[in-house]
Interface confidence: medium
């Protein structure tokens, strides 16, 4: 039996969000079963459907309504003919959308004007994605490649960060970390420090 | 003419064994998946199962999975439901339907009693 | 398992829009279908694949999905579209399908 994914290049990259059918011709065979398979494990989909283009010659059709990140991998179709177990050529699915965020900023408890990092990290496809910091309602850096780590220098009260993550299909806004104030007991080395600190919030640096 | 030409109403005792069968006509059996589906008096539908085209592989509503076993016979065009223990809840009206997702062909039904 | 959720009732004057819904967490990654059955008869398949009307059907029914909702719209519901009305999907996996609970479609 000849088997081929039709309709598809080689790789076939789609929307998050959009419909995708990935179609299986299958010649030579009178009754074939076919069967898709992503990433080596069988799809176990009912949606799909056949079509007899003639007696010997069918195509069958797997159709994804709504494509999401999960959906992308490798895909093919296979049947059973006479006890061996034919499969066509795979088609790589390339699922495109807004940045996915791998590393979100952490809430974190902090001397006043003590430094401290946060971590932001998202993915594609599509790449390139670029960080972009906020404190609070502020851009305070980039846009800058991700992953991106932001030094602070210090606060002197509870303060909010998050980060935006922005690539050609868009941008995804981060969780949104609390930094909140150590309480330092009175007396502390770290007490009398903050007195030989200036109070005002400091620019942070912004680096890879 | 596409038909599906079910067997006949059933009384059955529970814990008794039956089988009910759909035989199709007018379209090539091995080109359509056929699913089975449950309706009890005065309630709605219910997907049972179905059985592929070639009859190699069958899929199961979790409710009914181990409770039947929907079988075909290609060579007389003849699609099964088969019980190995009836119980007093499975007396319902049984419906084969020629496809999975496109139910486009329905059968008469076969009406299932199961009393003692 | 699986479930999808139908309202029981929905009751129209003739000539009015009636709208069916249809509750299901796998409805943004699967289609949803709809079938009608008239009192004593088998069920017919009136929209598939969301929003295709199946053949034979009359241009008054329309479907429609948006995230996890899908909706059969009547628009100018006729006495003869007195019946129950099921939506028909499949599981997140896909691995096995599922009616709704029926909708009852009076049109007073």
């Known amino acids: 039996a000849g088997l081929k994914l039709m309709g598809a290049p080689v790789k076939l990259t789609v929307s998050q969000g959009q419909p995708v059918k990935l179609n299986c011709s299958v010649e030579g065979m009178e009754e074939p079963d076919i069967q898709w398979v992503k990433d080596g494990a069988v799809v176990q989909n009912l949606d799909q459907l056949y079509i007899p283009v003639s007696e010997q010659h069918w195509i069958g059709f797997l159709s994804l309504k709504s494509v999401e990140r999960s959906d992308a991998g490798r895909y093919w179709c296979q049947v059973e003919d006479g006890g061996e177990t034919e499969i066509s050529q795979p088609v790589w699915l390339t699922v495109e959308g807004v940045p996915f965020f791998t590393v979100e900023p952490k809430d974190l408890a902090v001397p006043p004007n003590a430094p401290f990092q946060l971590s932001c990290e998202a993915v594609g496809p599509p790449e390139p994605v670029t960080i972009v910091w906020w404190r609070g309602t502020t851009k305070i850096g980039g846009p800058a490649p991700s992953p991106s780590v932001l030094n602070v220098t210090g606060v002197t009260q509870s303060t909010m960060f998050s980060c935006e993550a922005h690539n050609l299909k868009g941008l995804a806004s981060s969780r949104t970390a609390t930094v909140h104030l150590q309480l330092v007991p009175r007396g502390s080395s770290a007490h009398h420090h903050h007195h030989h600190h200036h109070s005002a919030w400091s620019h942070p640096q912004f680096e890879k | 003419e596409v038909q599906l030409v079910q067997s006949g109403a059933d009384v059955k005792k529970p814990g008794a064994s039956l089988t009910i069968s759909c035989q199709a006509s007018?379209?090539?059996?091995?080109?359509?998946?056929i699913s089975w589906v449950r309706q009890k008096p005065g309630k709605g539908l219910e997907w049972m199962g179905s059985?592929?085209?070639?009859?190699?592989?069958?899929h199961y509503g979790p409710s009914f999975q181990g409770h039947v076993t929907i079988s075909a016979d290609r060579s007389t065009a003849t699609a099964y439901l088969q019980w190995r223990s009836l119980e007093a809840s499975d007396t319902a009206m049984y419906y084969c339907?020629?496809?999975?997702?496109?139910?486009?062909?329905w059968g008469p039904g076969t009406l299932v009693t199961v009393s003692s | 398992s699986y479930e999808l959720t139908q309202p029981p009732s929905v009751s129209v004057s003739p000539g009015q829009t009636a709208r069916i819904t249809c509750s299901g967490d796998?409805?943004?990654?699967?289609?949803a279908y709809w079938y009608q059955q008239k009192s004593g008869q088998a069920p017919v398949l009136v929209i598939y694949?969301?929003?295709k009307r199946s053949s034979g059907i009359p241009e008054r029914f329309s479907g429609s999905s948006s995230g996890t909702m899908a909706t059969l719209t009547i628009s100018g519901a006729q006495v003869e579209d007195e019946a129950d009305y099921y939506c028909?999907?499949?599981?997140?996996?896909?691995?096995?399908?599922?009616f709704g609970g029926g909708t009852k479609l009076t049109v007073l």
């Open positions: 339907v020629r496809g999975y997702t496109h139910l486009r062909t």
């Open positions: 007018g379209y090539t059996f091995t080109d359509y998946w």
């Open positions: 059985i592929t085209r070639s009859s190699s592989r069958t």
């Open positions: 796998a409805l943004p990654k699967k289609y």
């Open positions: 694949e969301d929003s």
């Open positions: 028909y999907s499949a599981n997140q996996r896909g691995n096995y399908m599922v």
